[in-house]
């Protein structure tokens, strides 16, 4: 008895695909050893066709794959574009040779079945409509017309011209003639179900003079498309159900034991397990739509089906499309925090991983919104203008070559709570979902700026100080000037760094920035922050208003972001003449529903490449006293 198990007999027809699962005992050795699929020859030799070591034979090139699922103790052999030559005896097995542990599998590939000359074959998918054509001679023009279904020797009437309809075809079958045609009638059967398949006979007239036609109806169940995705990556289900259901509600469901549970539909239903990581996007007016799921989990693996029905729920006899999703736990996508917590008035720094091979790709950050289908408007991107309402408090710091970029959001409010997506215009699998949870602050913020009322006068010297606690002593402190294309680091001076590293006076840890002389273009948002290398930490923001020397009225700040600062101790500061080149990219924030839409956004941004780079000091100069 072999400990390997699988299907002993697999049968299919030419042109189809098979997906053969082989089960092996759950041991560490088995999980990691070579898996193979070989064809048994007459001489007893089993010739390898594909193995987990990367070997692929010539006859399987471009049409087969072998995927190991160590967490399930299974491996799957997929073979597409079957021909009758694939019929034969095979082994699926484990081990360094093809004589190790194995299981015998018989594969039989048949021709598409042929029928007698007088039989018309109709092949339709589940849920579709078939129109059966029935020819008759002029002598039967006024005779009774009927369609019956063969059941053994009997032929049970489905519909006839006396308006009889079999109850199981009620509201699905109609018998009609077209125009002035005197030699043909038609029977439409809609909402086809698997049990409709079989041999039908249509008849005009009675007895020996009757005209009869045979029709073989094949109702095809959808072949599930096999999708292999990595843990934490994303998947897009492209659903094309045809024009006849263009106006019906659409859904994606996951097959459960008893039912197919709706994950999302166009009537606003959404499974809570997919909250924050799903989008349904209509593609066109012909009923095409796509469903994108990000942040794939192990438990997302399974059988999915999309369909259409006015109820937004699966109904027998309505068209469907099917997939089987496999989620590979050996993922190239790093594990990152799925929940980030912040407090009101504070800030968060969110690290977004991306494919390190695509460091030049455009990076984006969008806010998932729970409208009926889910949408994710872009808030910020490497070449995208920051969305209205996020000016001065949101920036994207690209760190080329590191395989990650950082998004910082400060001046947090409870309204910022929700789901956000990291995405690029490159590898679509690298989309991560983050849930931001913002709680009410219970203590004062770690970083505080003085003076609170930051109004600078043109031509004069203006200094702002940022107080930080001792816990940030060893971290790098920085000031940056926020603009639509990032927050550009400025020269600054750290007072705390002068002190002995042994003691830390909580009241005198200060990093300051001086504008000397103040210019009109210095007006805007400034951030004080801490970081360690490329790891960004806490930030706080202040708006610096600039006014003429003669003007007496104080400048009114655009937000209350400056209301938190305290008086600063005296300090010696570094002066910096700050210039800011604002090269704004004109990227409309868009709903990033799938690869194509992201690609479009990327193409648009490519035309507007900005020379400024978030996190760089380009365009600024500093001088020390």
């Amino acid at each position: 008895q072999s400990p390997i198990f699988g299907p002993q007999d697999v049968s299919s027809i030419e042109g189809n695909s098979v997906s053969i699962t082989c089960y092996y005992p759950d041991t560490s050795v088995n999980r990691h050893t070579r898996k193979y699929w070989c064809r048994q020859g007459a001489n007893g030799y089993c010739a390898t066709l594909i193995s987990s070591n990367g070997y692929l034979s010539k006859e399987y090139s471009g049409r087969a794959s072998l995927i190991n699922f160590p967490e399930n103790s299974t491996f799957v052999i997929n073979i597409a574009h079957l021909t009758q030559e694939d019929t034969g005896s095979y082994k699926c097995g484990l081990g360094t040779t093809n004589r190790g542990l194995f299981f015998d599998v018989s594969l039989e590939v048949s021709q598409v079945p042929e029928f007698p000359n007088d039989t018309h074959v109709y092949t339709k998918d589940i849920g579709r409509t078939v129109t059966i054509e029935c020819r008759f001679k002029e002598g039967n023009a006024h005779s009774k017309k009927s369609l019956c279904k063969k059941r053994g020797e009997a032929c049970e009437v489905v519909i006839d011209s006396t308006e009889y309809v079999d109850p199981s075809y009620k509201d699905r079958a109609i018998l009609f003639m077209k125009g002035t045609s005197r030699d043909i009638f038609y029977v439409n059967i809609s909402h086809l179900i698997p049990s409709d398949a079989g041999l039908y006979v249509c008849q005009a007239g009675e007895g020996p003079s009757a005209d009869k036609n045979n029709a073989d109806l094949q109702v095809l169940e959808p072949e599930p498309e096999l999708l292999y995705k990595d843990l934490r990556s994303s998947v897009t289900f492209e659903c094309d159900l045809g024009r006849e259901v263009a106006n019906d509600a659409k859904y994606l469901c996951r097959k459960n034991k008893e039912t197919c549970d709706v994950i999302i539909n166009t009537l606003g239903k959404r499974d809570p397990a997919f909250e924050g990581r799903i989008l349904l996007t209509p593609r066109d007016d012909n009923g095409r739509f796509s469903v994108l799921i990000t942040g794939l989990r192990k438990e997302d693996a399974g059988h999915y089906q999309c369909g259409a029905h006015s109820s937004g729920l699966p109904q027998e006899g309505w068209p469907v499309q099917a997939w089987q999703l496999f989620v590979n736990e050996e993922s190239t996508i790093p594990n990152s925090r799925s929940v980030v917590k912040g407090v009101t008035g504070g800030s968060v720094a969110i690290v977004c991983p991306y494919n390190p091979k695509e460091s030049s790709s455009l990076k984006y950050w969008c806010h998932w919104e729970a409208d009926e289908n889910g949408r994710c408007p872009v808030l910020v991107g490497t070449q995208a203008l920051v969305q209205e309402g996020y000016e001065g408090r949101l920036a994207l710091f690209d760190q080329p070559g590191s395989g990650a970029y950082t998004v910082i959001l400060n001046q947090l409010t409870t309204q910022d709570s929700g789901f956000y997506w990291c995405l690029t215009d490159g590898d679509s699998r690298w989309r991560t979902t983050i849930e931001l949870q913002v709680a009410e602050a219970t203590k004062k913020p770690d970083l505080e700026v003085t003076p609170q009322n930051a109004t600078a006068v043109i031509g004069e010297t203006f200094t702002i100080s940022c107080h930080y606690p001792c816990k940030f002593y060893s971290q790098e402190k920085y000031w940056c000037k926020w603009s639509n294309d990032g927050c550009h680091i400025l020269p600054s001076h750290d007072e705390g760094a002068r002190q002995s590293s042994v003691s830390c006076d909580q009241s005198s840890q200060i990093v300051s920035m001086t504008l000397n002389p103040v210019k009109k273009e210095d007006e805007g948002w400034y951030w004080c922050g801490v970081k360690e290398g490329q790891v960004y930490g806490e930030t706080t923001a202040i708006y610096v208003a600039v006014e003429e020397r003669t003007r007496g009225s104080p400048h009114i700040n655009p937000t209350d972001a400056n209301a938190r600062a305290k008086d600063a101790p005296e300090e010696e500061a570094m002066e910096s003449s700050v210039r800011e080149d604002e090269n704004k990219a004109n990227l409309d924030p868009r709903l990033f529903a799938d690869e194509r839409e992201i690609q479009n956004a990327g193409d648009q941004a490519q035309e507007n490449r900005a020379s400024g780079n978030a996190g760089s000091a380009g365009g600024q100069s500093g001088s020390s006293k």
Epitope: N16, I20, P222, E223, K255, A322
Partner: nanobody, 126 residues
Framework: EVQLVESGGGLVQAGDSLRLSCAAS????????VGWFRQAPGKEREFVTT??????????YYADSVKGRFTISRDNAKNTVYLQMNSLKPDDTAVYYC?????????????????WGQGTQVTVSS
Amino acid sequence: EVQLVESGGGLVQAGDSLRLSCAASGRTFTTYGVGWFRQAPGKEREFVTTITWSGSTNYKYYADSVKGRFTISRDNAKNTVYLQMNSLKPDDTAVYYCAASTVLTDPRVPTEYDYWGQGTQVTVSS
């Protein structure tokens, strides 16, 4: 809900043949696994055979103890699955249950199946 009804059981001599039928009614799914399990008195329910299908592709799984003797097949138009049992042995005596599932991770595991028939008795005398 799917209802499963088994038929075809009975008393036969060792070496004889028997054909069991499992008729499904109610909600039908596009991808199915229908299997046969058996339970002898005082023993656990054991896997016999399963057929799964996807479109026009069929996969047939058998327990080692019945390989070469039992054959599973299906008639899609009749929503029926058959178990042809040849060369029956006294060890094959048991109540045979038909089971169905829409999602099967491992066809040998009874808990993977959601729908069960009432069972049909097969007795093989020596």
